[in-house]
């Protein structure tokens, strides 16, 4: 029997130092750019192997960066938000959403809370 | 991690066509930059064709323009290489090839210069 696919959603602080070739990773979405449907936020596409994120190791393929060195990244234009990072500076602190994808009880089985009923 | 599976591969009389198929499975196929790599006897491996996250930009090695074509079916999680008008030079391992795409938050790069963070076990392809 198969199980049921739910998220458990985090969030966390990561703090950055700038790397000799940045800060390592690439962003999608944006307001003109939806990567999630009915979502205009910015999400971590990939991390480069070797950059300062790869090497801190917290930022995911997939996060969600809700905001960077304070400054929320809702209602951004793509390349607004890709300019916000370029410009960022040499310590860079990010609030991300990590969604983490957890096997429930079969299906059938509905726990407490599942919006799906 | 990503894992891609190529078909299509073969043998074929120079002026025929071959289309090549790769599947992507392991993370969303609509956030990947995707890639056709070969390497010819003896050669470095070479980028032949890539298709951006979106599917509005592609890139093609100046030797395959006008011959190749390169296509993206994010339902299926499919790239594709249509080839025509083959030559005997095309011969080659031919490797499909992925990355995350998007934007670098630190500089642009040229979409021809495609580092793979994945990559196929390759099709053999043969044009006598």
């Known amino acids: 029997m198969n199980g049921r696919v739910d998220y458990l959603v985090t969030e966390e602080e990561i703090n950055l130092t700038r790397g000799p070739s940045g800060l390592g990773f690439n962003i999608v979405g944006g307001t003109d750019q939806q990567y999630v449907s009915n979502d205009s936020g910015i999400y971590v596409s990939r991390i480069k192997e070797n950059g300062a994120a790869a090497l801190d190791g917290r930022l995911q393929e997939g996060d969600k960066i809700l905001s960077v060195n304070g400054q929320d990244l809702k209602n951004l234009l793509h390349q607004d938000a890709v300019d916000l990072f370029r410009n960022a500076g040499y310590a860079v602190s990010l609030r991300v959403q990590h969604r983490l994808q957890v096997q429930n009880g079969p299906i059938g089985h509905r726990g407490e809370g599942d919006p799906s009923g | 991690d990503v894992q891609l599976v190529e078909s299509g591969g073969g043998l074929v009389q120079a002026g025929g066509s071959l289309r090549l198929s790769c599947a992507a499975s392991g993370r969303p196929f609509s956030s990947l930059d995707m890639g056709w790599f070969r390497q010819r006897p003896g050669k470095e491996r070479d980028v032949v064709a890539t298709?951006?996250?979106?599917?509005?930009?592609?890139y093609y090695l100046d030797s395959v323009k006008g011959r190749f074509t390169i296509s993206r079916d994010n339902a299926k999680n499919t790239v594709f290489l249509q080839m025509n008008s083959l030559k005997p030079e095309d011969t080659a391992v031919y490797y499909c090839a992925a990355r995350g795409g998007g934007s670098s938050v630190d500089s642009e790069y040229d979409v021809g210069e495609f580092e793979s963070d994945y990559w196929g076990q390759g099709t053999q392809v043969t044009v006598s």
């Open positions: 298709i951006n996250w979106t599917g509005d930009s592609t």
